[in-house]
Amino acid sequence: NECPELQPPVHGKIEPSQAKYFFKDQVLVSCDTGYKVLKDNVEMDTFQIECLKDGTWSNKIPTCKIVDCRAPGELEHGLITFSTRNNLTTYKSEIKYSCQEPYYKMLNNNTGIYTCSAQGVWMNKVLGRSLPTCLPVCGLPKFSRKLMARIFNGRPAQKGTTPWIAMLSHLNGQPFCGGSLLGSSWIVTAAHCLHQSLDPEDPTLRDSDLLSPSDFKIILGKHWRLRSDENEQHLGVKHTTLHPQYDPNTFENDVALVELLESPVLNAFVMPICLPEGPQQEGAMVIVSGWGKQFLQRFPETLMEIEIPIVDHSTCQKAYAPLKKKVTRDMICAGEKEGGKDACAGDSGGPMVTLNRERGQWYLVGTVSWGDDCGKKDRYGVYSYIHHNKDWIQRVTGVRN
């Protein structure tokens, strides 16, 4: 018994292809690359039909439907543009992922181009089916400093030139320390900012001495100390991590990390600082910023900054030797022999940064830690040296420049 001639589906084929088909002959229907067999609304790779005793086919010929990769996955801090008209998502369609510039940049400078594969998944030549990653751009403020003459005793910072600075504030709005934004969800600050002052008679760190995440908040995009800023973002604290080798008596490894409950929106007034790429050279100029006390023991109205040179380690050690204070390898000193320019109470944890002129990028050198009074002659400001603890910071945060 002969069955009727078969027509292959559009974009498909039948095998074996014969002039005549008889009882018990079987044919396999398959589709071209990028198409799937569709039978009764079910997609499959192939479909088999058989010539029956009564000269009819066991089933109708199915259709071939173009593979659809469907809507591509959303990219955090990124956008999708369709290269094909009508935003097609079918086989061989192309899309391009890009990051929200200028605040995010694609990891490894990936092209971001994905093509809809025959398997129905968006594929990139390098990343395969994995989505690209948009990393925060660090150390490139939208507003650049007017080239400064040397600052004396500090000066008000220009708004937006220090977008990485964070204010650590009690819930009542009272600021108590500074910090710097790293990546999109971490603040680096001084470990001594996260516990109450210790009793000199028994300087051990107890559970009760530590600030709990619910005790304080982080404010980014801040310029005024107490007045509200239109650009400020208030963020809750998820977790705090003090350096495991921190010593509250000597301020050794005086660095801590604060994990934010949610990521801030990066913009012209909120941007992370870059981690140092190498050691800091003695004599290099650095900028220290904060809302700490000024020389008349008054707090400023706005963010202040000073420009000072890095001081040789042995010079700094000698300066503090008479006070029996150790300047260890995890510390870096800055300031001028004659004094007058220094960080002070309330600046703790805040950033000391330097400009890499070749790249035009700002890097974190240190965080404000300790000193003998403020701006004293022959005494330098001592900062926690970020380069020394960069490995630890990267271990905890996963942040890379």
């Epitope: 051990t204 760190l205 107890r206 559970d207 495991p244 080798q245 150790k326 905890v396």
Partner: antibody, heavy 112, light 112 residues
Framework: SVEESGGRLVTPGTPLTLTCTAS????????MNWVRQAPGKGLEWIGI?????STWYASWAKGRFTISKTSTTVDLKITSPTTEDTATYFC??????????WGPGTLVTVSS | AVVLTQTASPVSAPVGGTVTIKCQAS??????LAWYQQKPGQSPKLLIY???TLVSGVSSRFSGSRSGTEFSLTISDLECADAATYYC??????????????FGGGTKVEIK
């Protein structure tokens, strides 16, 4: 590498000092832990000495042990050993809180 | 001080199997937890730090994870050489500075 020495049989109350020496890195700029392990028991952290020389002890170890350092050694003094102090004592380099390099240990037996 | 409570010993599994050891911290310590392996007569060896980061040179059959204050060490595709006691260690600085490092009680893994 690190190596401990000075472990021996002592009578209760006789002070004993254990010494840790290092090769391949400088002890003067290292952070060093002392950990002990009683026979058939678990690890017990005793204390740590920082690069600056400051020391921190486990609450149970305060007053019973003293950690000190020279430019080439880190010492652990058991001030007044009791039979409970019988253990293998390890010296281990501290790497941001973890002990990444351990010595083979030295056995201290306290018995009358 | 932070107390670490580990899975009771011994834990037994066949060659080629998988074993998971748990370590419960008495308070939040973030990811400041390490895992060590100690074979009889040897000093401990650091396997994992930061709750889940494998130390360079350690087999990828070892993996660590964290869920709140509960930490896990999983050893897959077990080999006879994995027979050892495994310890977790906290290095989170929140407790009194006396106890800057603490170990769990250890979990012995036996291979059938």
């Amino acid at each position: 590498s690190v190596e401990e020495s000075g472990g021996r049989l002592v009578t209760p109350g006789t002070p004993l000092t254990l010494t840790c020496t290092a090769s391949g890195f400088s002890l003067s700029s290292a952070y060093m832990n002392w950990v002990r392990q009683a026979p058939g028991k678990g690890l017990e952290w005793i204390g740590i000495i920082y690069a600056s020389g400051s020391t921190w002890y486990a609450s149970w170890a305060k007053g019973r042990f003293t950690i000190s350092k020279t430019s080439t050694t880190v010492d652990l003094k058991i001030t007044s050993p009791t039979t409970e102090d019988t253990a293998t004592y390890f010296c281990a380099r501290d790497d941001y809180g973890t002990a990444d390099l351990w010595g083979p240990g030295t056995l201290v037996t306290v018995s009358s | 001080a932070v107390v670490l409570t580990q899975t009771a010993s011994p834990v037994s599994a066949p060659v080629g199997g998988t074993v998971t050891i748990k370590c419960q911290a008495s308070q939040s310590i973030g990811s400041s937890l390490a895992w060590y392996q100690q074979k009889p007569g040897q000093s401990p060896k650091l396997l994992i730090y930061g709750a889940s980061t494998l130390v360079s040179g350690v087999s990828s059959r070892f993996s660590g994870s964290r869920s709140g204050t509960e930490f896990s060490l999983t050893i897959s595709d077990l080999e006879c050489a994995d027979a050892a006691t495994y310890y977790c260690q906290n290095y989170y600085l929140s407790s009194s500075s006396a106890d800057r490092r603490t170990f769990g009680g250890g979990t012995k893994v036996e291979i059938k």
